[in-house]
Every structure is written in C-alpha cells, then in structure tokens.
C-alpha cells in the first residue's frame, strides 16, 4: 500500500490556514470536491464541498471554511479562517467520484492550531475576522448528496457570507512552485 | 427503498464469538459508511465502530478495540460485524445503522438482532 | 469521549401540550463549517431508533414539522410544538463531532 505522506502546518489561533490542493486537470476539473477531516482512529469526516458540477473559480463558504476550485490550474484552494485550537488535525482534499471511494489528493495536511498572538508578519488575526464574516449555523446539508437520500426538510437560508475580497484573487504563473505553500496575509 | 436486513437472533455461551451480519438494499452501498450500536436490555444506545464499505476500512470504539471485527462483501451489499471473547454483559440487540461522510445522521437503521450471552 | 447529559430523565405529557428535552455535551460540538454535530433519535417501544434531526437543527425526511431542534456549542434543544400520542419513547442526543456518543434518554410518555 502506499504511504501516506503528510504536510505539517503550525499556525496561531485567528490565522488563516490557505492551502492548495493539485489534480489532474483533464480527469476532474469539473468533479466535485471535498475538504475532509481525519481524527485520529476515525474515518474521514466531509466538512465542506464544491457544487456539483464544480465551478470555475466560485468560492464556496462553509462556516469558516472557503473552497475555491481553479479549473485552468487543476487547482482547489482550501481557506479556513480564523482558526481554533480545536481545528487540529489531519486533514485532506478529495475529488467525488460515486459510487467509488474519493480520490485522495497528495498529501495530507497536519494542522497545529495553537493559542496565542504570535506577534509576527505571519500573524492575522485582525485582518481574518475583518475580512471574512462568518455566517451562523446553516440548515442545508452539508454537501450535495449524490445518490438517492432522504431530504432535508428545510430550505437553506441565503448566505451572507462575502467572499469577494481582494484576497480571493490568486494569481498563477509557476504553478508547481506554489502547491501547498501557506498564505499568512 | 433503502432497507438495512439483519441476520437473526443468537445465543452465545461466554468466551464464544458472535458474527451478525447486515444486508443492504435500496441505495448504493459503497457510498456511505455502516455503523454499529449496541442496546443492553434496558438500557441506552452504545456506539460501537463504523465500516467504509467502499475501501473496507473500520474505526472502532475504544471499548470494543481488539474484540470488534467489522468487514464487508461488496457482492452482496452486505456488512458484518464480529464480536469476540463474550460476556454476559454483552447481551444485547445490536443494529446497523448508515451514516454518510458529508454527515446527514444515522438515516436508515437495522431490525436489530439480539445476542444473549449465557452460560 | 464527548459526554452527553440529558434531561429530564422522565418526562410526562399532555397530548396538544408542548414539550422539550435538553441535551448538553462536556465539549462543544460546532465545527469549523458552522455546523452542530449533534443528532436527535427517538426510538418508539419496540422498535429501532429513528432519525429526527441531525447537525443541530435539521430535520430529517418524513419527520413532521412539530419537531424542531436548537443550540449551539455545548447546549441543545429538542422541542415539541404539540405533542402527539405516537411521540412516545425515548430520545437520545447524540454527537458526532468527535468518536460518536450518546445521551442517557429521555423517556416521554403520556401522562
């Protein structure tokens, strides 16, 4: 089997975890995509997804977490906000494929959340809860579902959720060089 | 429609092992997760562990580490759930229950099979 | 493991009259996406458990609207607007934000 390999990132409560997650551009630019939880022992746990189709470039924003899926680059961005201590964990991309088991995205992503003002140019804590307003718990499922199931009963409310910041403007030009770098704004 | 069809009741004597089994129907079983909780006679509801039907892979409750076994057939859309070394305390009705990896609830659960643990 | 307390242990009702159970977690249960990973299941005597709400304040499919879930962190609320004759049984909270435990049950039954 192969080994899975992980990326580690320590990051202070209030900051931003922004990560990259690369694919195969002509197999699943338009499949949808998933961020996924792994606590330790347990199985991989969806917190947020893209559209199905996935969209070009339309930010999708769970809670404090925003997806954004760049097709021309083969590329999901991973954005969670304001980070928690209890954020930590592993963590990792997938691409639905249904029925089959999700593709995993290389690799898998180590985050320590720790509490804190670091003090540093890393830190961001103000601009993170500035930027982002953080919408109240939803009612929709958490993703869309993709087989037959039972459906929720209550429509989901509008989100209120602004991310149309300059800060969702990513430039590429040497995409390789970028894969998993962390962002500190 | 989605049905979850479990194997029927058992008696096991203490030290012994016990195998139920859960059938799936009505939806692609590959695509969500299988979970087991256990009810002791009168009392309340205990997570055991889940399986992936899809790739196999398991996570079991701390309690029940080393005496749980939970596999799948994929052929038969069927999960099984092992458990070894009884004791009387062990009695109880098990059930399956199918959970999803996006998370909506255990939505469909089992009849529930009871296992009598007695010497 | 999360611990999850409910009450009352009992709760005697009156058919049309509103009711309402409590369930509170030893740690919060909001996730990083917004959502409470707390599930509400009744199981009527005799028989299986059956979803009634699941992340907080959902409403699972075919479960009339008199049932509502609420709360947030570590406090959670399952009311019934009006309950009814075959609203009796148990109801468990349960958790899933970490490795999935249950409340202890909160018994209805008609008064």
């Known amino acids: 089997a192969t080994k899975l390999t992980e990326e580690k990132y320590e990051l202070k409560e209030g900051q931003t975890l922004d990560v990259k997650c690369d694919y195969t551009l002509e197999k699943f630019a338009s499949s949808q995509k998933a961020w996924q939880i792994i606590r330790d022992g347990e199985m991989p746990k969806t917190l947020a997804c893209t559209e199905r189709p996935s969209k070009n470039s339309h930010p999708v924003q769970v809670g404090r977490i925003i997806l954004e899926d760049y097709h021309d680059h083969g590329l999901l961005r991973v954005r969670m906000v304001n980070l928690q201590v209890e954020d930590s964990g592993l963590y990792q991309c997938v691409i639905y494929q249904p029925p089959k088991e999700p593709h995993m995205l290389f690799d898998r992503i180590r985050l320590v959340v720790t509490k804190g003002f670091s003090g540093t140019p890393g830190s961001n804590e103000n601009s993170t809860q500035n930027v982002y307003k953080i919408p109240p718990t939803t009612t929709k499922a958490l993703c869309p579902l993709y087989t037959s199931p039972r459906t929720v009963t209550q429509a989901p409310p509008k989100s209120t959720a602004d991310v149309s910041t300059p800060d969702s403007e990513i430039n590429l030009t040497n995409v390789t060089d970028i894969i998993r770098v962390p962002v500190f704004n | 429609q989605v049905q979850l069809v479990q194997s029927g009741a058992e008696v096991k004597k203490p030290g012994a092992s016990v195998k139920v089994s859960c059938k799936a129907s009505g939806y692609t079983f590959t695509s969500y997760y299988m979970h087991w909780v256990r009810q002791a006679p009168g009392q309340g509801l205990e997570w055991m562990g889940v399986i992936n039907p899809s790739g196999g892979s398991t996570s079991y409750a701390q309690k029940f580490q080393g005496r749980v076994t939970m596999t799948r057939d994929t052929s038969t859309s069927t999960v099984y759930m092992e458990l070894s070394s009884l004791r009387s305390e062990d009695t109880a009705v098990y059930y399956c229950a199918r959970g999803a990896d996006y998370y909506a609830g255990f939505d469909y659960w089992g009849q529930g099979t009871l296992v009598t643990v007695s010497s | 493991d999360i611990v999850m307390t409910q009450s009352p242990l009992s709760l005697p009702v009156t058919p049309g009259e509103p009711a309402s159970i409590s369930c509170r977690s030893s740690q919060s249960l909001l996730h990083s996406n917004g959502y409470n990973y707390l599930d509400w299941y009744l199981q009527k005597p005799g028989q299986s458990p059956q979803l009634l709400i699941y992340l907080g304040s959902n409403r699972a499919s075919g479960v009339p609207d008199r049932f509502s879930g609420s709360g947030s962190g570590t406090d959670f609320t399952l009311k019934i607007s009006r309950v009814e004759a075959e609203d009796v049984g148990v109801y468990y909270c349960?958790?899933?934000?970490?490795?999935?435990?249950f409340g202890g049950g909160t018994k209805v039954e008609i008064k």
């Open positions: 349960m958790q899933t934000r970490h490795t999935p435990t």
